[in-house]
């Protein structure tokens, strides 16, 4: 309840986060022409990536283009890209639609479709769907522990979310343990009333709100987080328009002395973890 | 099955020419990118060659770039090898192959991402 009598001031925070699980991931791997189910396994240094500010990311779905090489090559022929002859094709002109330079020439892409050269990371990156269903969907069962320390500068009164009595093996539950830091990612799903499996395909952004409401007189003093969650991406967003949440990041390496990259498009959830509250006293 | 059949091979002496051809059956190859591969007695069996499937672009080892050029021909069905200013090292049996990915213009060295390795032509170049 509000309490006129006291002096309020605003919470400040700083989040720290941990996520741990293991995945193992099956898609299918062509080699000379064959094509055979591979198995792979994430852990925590593959799915997770530094986010700035009260932020983490874990990986869901991916998709990837392997071995590319600087050189030239045709552009993917992607909706306005097709040419017919040279004159379609500038030279040294950048598309921001495109994955290169191009060089002034229309070659064949493929039997029934010519795109302008391109100098670039070839072959260019094709426009694929995302794989459905996610190759990491066990990621639903993966853990974060967030630890959050709070100041009160006006009451010089610090706290944080881990009592020293907290069982390291314990896992939220609104009802049986609404104090424990660690969360299932499938469960912070369910409270939102979202569907994990359903946005591990395309990714998007789940916010974690932690809401400190501290009444800091000694008579009656409490002071401990609430969690609530919820998503924050558009998920009614018309799929020809961005859907989900995505970025590109690539892995280079060296093969007999050519610089090659796999390029991956990495879908997933971003974690925002979003603190708010008081501190009142007398 | 596809069937690759080389031919154009022989004696010749440093500095000469040689045009080596490899005729596929069995199903058309225009879709895919082809390569040349040679084999020196005692030696593994290494990349020589190779042109993608539209015949635009080309690949070689360092050793022949300049002396050697690959073309296919994609309504013969045929593949091509002009090999000008041979040195006694290129000596070997010469295969033709066919690329099945993925990823021709990474992979085009790798001999395990070819396939169905013809029966081979002898080069033998007399110094």
């Known amino acids: 309840s509000d309490k006129l009598y006291q002096r309020k001031e605003p919470v400040i925070s700083s989040v720290h986060t941990k996520v741990k699980g293991i995945a193992e991931v099956t898609e299918n791997v062509t080699e000379g022409g064959v094509t055979k189910l591979g198995h792979s396994i994430f852990d925590t240094a593959d799915y997770t990536f530094p986010l700035q500010g009260n932020s983490f990311f874990v990986m869901t779905n991916y998709v990837k283009s392997e071995g590319q090489v600087q050189t030239l090559c045709p552009e993917y022929p992607r909706r306005g890209a097709q040419c017919s002859s040279d004159r379609r094709c500038k030279k040294g002109w950048m598309d921001p639609q495109s994955k290169g330079i191009q060089t002034g020439r229309c070659v064949p892409y493929d039997k029934t479709r010519k795109t302008c050269e391109v100098s670039a990371w070839c072959p260019t990156e094709e426009e694929k769907e995302a794989p459905r269903p996610a190759l990491l969907r066990s990621a639903e069962n993966f853990t974060v522990l967030i630890k959050n320390n709070i100041h009160f500068p006006g009451h010089n009164y610090t706290t944080r979310n881990i009592l020293p009595t907290m069982n390291g093996s314990c896992t939220f539950h609104k009802t049986w343990d609404p104090q424990c830091s660690i969360f299932r990612l499938g469960d912070i799903f369910q409270e939102a009333g979202e569907n994990f499996t359903e946005v591990a395909v395309q990714g998007g952004i789940m916010g974690i709100e932690i809401y400190w409401d501290c009444n800091l007189d000694s008579w009656s003093h409490h002071c401990r987080p609430r969690y609530s969650f919820r998503r924050l991406d558009d998920k009614n967003t018309d799929e020809s328009f961005v859907p989900g949440y995505n970025f590109r990041y690539a892995k280079y390496y060296k093969e007999n002395n050519v610089e090659k990259r796999t390029l991956i498009k990495a879908f997933g959830i971003r974690f925002d973890i979003l603190v708010f509250g008081t501190g009142g006293k007398f | 099955e596809v069937q690759l059949v080389e031919s154009g091979g022989g004696l010749v002496q440093a500095g000469g020419s040689l045009r080596l051809s490899c005729a596929a059956s069995g199903r058309t190859v225009s879709d895919y990118g082809m390569g040349w591969f040679r084999q020196a007695p005692g030696k593994l069996r290494e990349f020589v060659a190779s042109?993608?499937?539209?015949?635009?672009?080309?690949r070689y080892i360092d050793s022949v770039e300049g002396r050697f050029t690959i073309s296919r021909d994609n309504t013969k069905n045929t593949l091509y090898l002009q090999m000008n200013n041979l040195k006694a090292e290129d000596t070997a049996v010469y295969y033709c192959a066919y690329f099945l990915g993925p990823n021709w213009y990474s992979n085009y060295g790798r001999p395990s991402s070819y396939g169905f390795y013809g029966q081979g032509t002898q080069v033998t170049v007399s110094s």
């Open positions: 042109i993608n499937w539209s015949g635009i672009y080309t």
